[in-house]
Amino acid sequence: QRFAQAQQQLPLESLGWDVAELQLNHTGPQQDPRLYWQGGPALGRSFLHGPELDKGQLRIHRDGIYMVHIQVTLAICSSTTASRHHPTTLAVGICSPASRSISLLRLSFHQGCTIASQRLTPLARGDTLCTNLTGTLLPSRNTDETFFGVQWVRP
Amino acid sequence: QRFAQAQQQLPLESLGWDVAELQLNHTGPQQDPRLYWQGGPALGRSFLHGPELDKGQLRIHRDGIYMVHIQVTLAICSSTTASRHHPTTLAVGICSPASRSISLLRLSFHQGCTIASQRLTPLARGDTLCTNLTGTLLPSRNTDETFFGVQWVRP
Amino acid sequence: QRFAQAQQQLPLESLGWDVAELQLNHTGPQQDPRLYWQGGPALGRSFLHGPELDKGQLRIHRDGIYMVHIQVTLAICSSTTASRHHPTTLAVGICSPASRSISLLRLSFHQGCTIASQRLTPLARGDTLCTNLTGTLLPSRNTDETFFGVQWVRP
């Protein structure tokens, strides 16, 4: 009983429960393949508990192993469009600091208009995650079609 | 050592480890696009620890942020079938209470016969999740091809 | 404060935070559809904390409910290749002990060159997970395109 009370009194942050779910804000200007994200209760069902946004990119605040997940749906798309513009590719990676730059997760659309995946990966405080969408097709900004999130899993 | 013992004695429910994994029971009658789910050890590898089923739909028992995931495979399907019946779409949303009704996750099959995705979302006690499959194609009831689940992640 | 200190002193293993993320090592010889995995910090961003590898297959060390996830990308592939070689199918299952053999998750490539999915499933100490890729197409060994992992969720 005492333990349960103690647990409730501890701030969640000390338990390492960092988590974020973001919705698409906008795409980058020409020559910038990055997707720019936004999050917060005022925007709907997106949120940031621990991680932060830095110019639309997600910055990690706690070292650990994270589950990273993403879904991106193309807005003006059919299987014909997708194959004609193949390969439209989505890559999630650490883009800063430059010394830790690496691609973590990559998928092509081929003849589909949605990609969705997830993976476990170690991330460190200060890592900024970027999501690059190659090609010219526009992603949907519907919050149930395009989203990106991370969940702290363990140290 | 005392803490470890205390932790083991605490009921899991008090730690907020609500989790469910469901298998497809049946599709709805005409004009009802919902999929109806079932779960429990007698049925195989499906289970409900915390959430409950209400007429085949999943009802949440604990407030928090959840990881929601789903995979649906169409039973009599080829890439030709899928494109000819396009758009066959799967949407997961809160369907009751009506005041909280919202689509959480949506995917189209395009030229594929399986969709799979996951996302983080806040859910509240009493939220009922519905999974709507538009179109006339039949989903597979194989437990390794079609499943739906939630996992409590944090308050 | 005392609780927070006690928590930090507890080995993570006693909290049941078993987790693994693997990268593709090689495919099997003729008549062996299994993918063979490898993991460890020397190999990049893959790791095993709890589970172990047994001849390239993942063996579980702790009973519980796990989130299992996988992504496989085909290396020499286009939507035409994928459909011509259909059905190329990926199945994740318990392959040993034989008494517990079962398919947990199955997807076909249809006209795509990547599959990705995840599910919750109960696993027991000693369960070995195998990933079978039917057909003759070669999977990519790029670590951001093909990976397989598990995360302990609750007892």
Partner: antibody, heavy 120, light 107 residues
Amino acid sequence: EVQLLESGGGLVQPGGSLRLSCAASGFTFSSYAMSWVRQSPGKCLEWVSAISGSGGRAQYAESVQGRFTVSRDNSKNTLYLQMNSLRAEDTAVYYCAKHDYSNYPYFDYWGQGTLVTVSS
Amino acid sequence: EIVLTQSPATLSVSPGERATLSCRASQSVSSNLAWYQQKPGQAPRLLIYGSSSRATGIPDRFSGSGSGTDFTLTISRLEPEDFAVYYCQQYGSSPPPFGCGTKVEIK
């Protein structure tokens, strides 16, 4: 030093068969996918076939599917290409090539090639 | 099926000069493009992969750029041993086609 040495080329009549070999050294042969690539006189390079490191998976260009079979013997560090029902358009220099670790078909090492001539 | 078109077919350059070779894909290949050098009677040699990454042992006068459909191989200062035929190859989809080459000859 990585070395790939092809052999088995020669003159064959249309409809005939030939078996090419490629002896590999200087790397862990069984760890890498391998391909055959051909170059017709005065023409472009053309990918023919690929095989996984273990030998359990193989892929072919449409132009040779059903006629050619790629195989390997990892105990002998040797790659093979069995060519049946040969046609005039199969005339080319055949190279064996080592894939990058990723299994993607770009080739960091090539053999010197062996000439196959299909003519009556 | 993706078609790669190389231009020019022949490029006449003096030693020490810069050479710029082009490869255009019929549809986007992302960055899945490699460049090879082939001298008469020899096998091709990998120069660049991933559009811009130099292969092991390749001098830094060779550089690759581009993504999507337009790619360039640049040789900053031509050495006598650089006169050869250069091929581009797409490897992101099946089949993995090659271009038909650009011959770099001494002016």
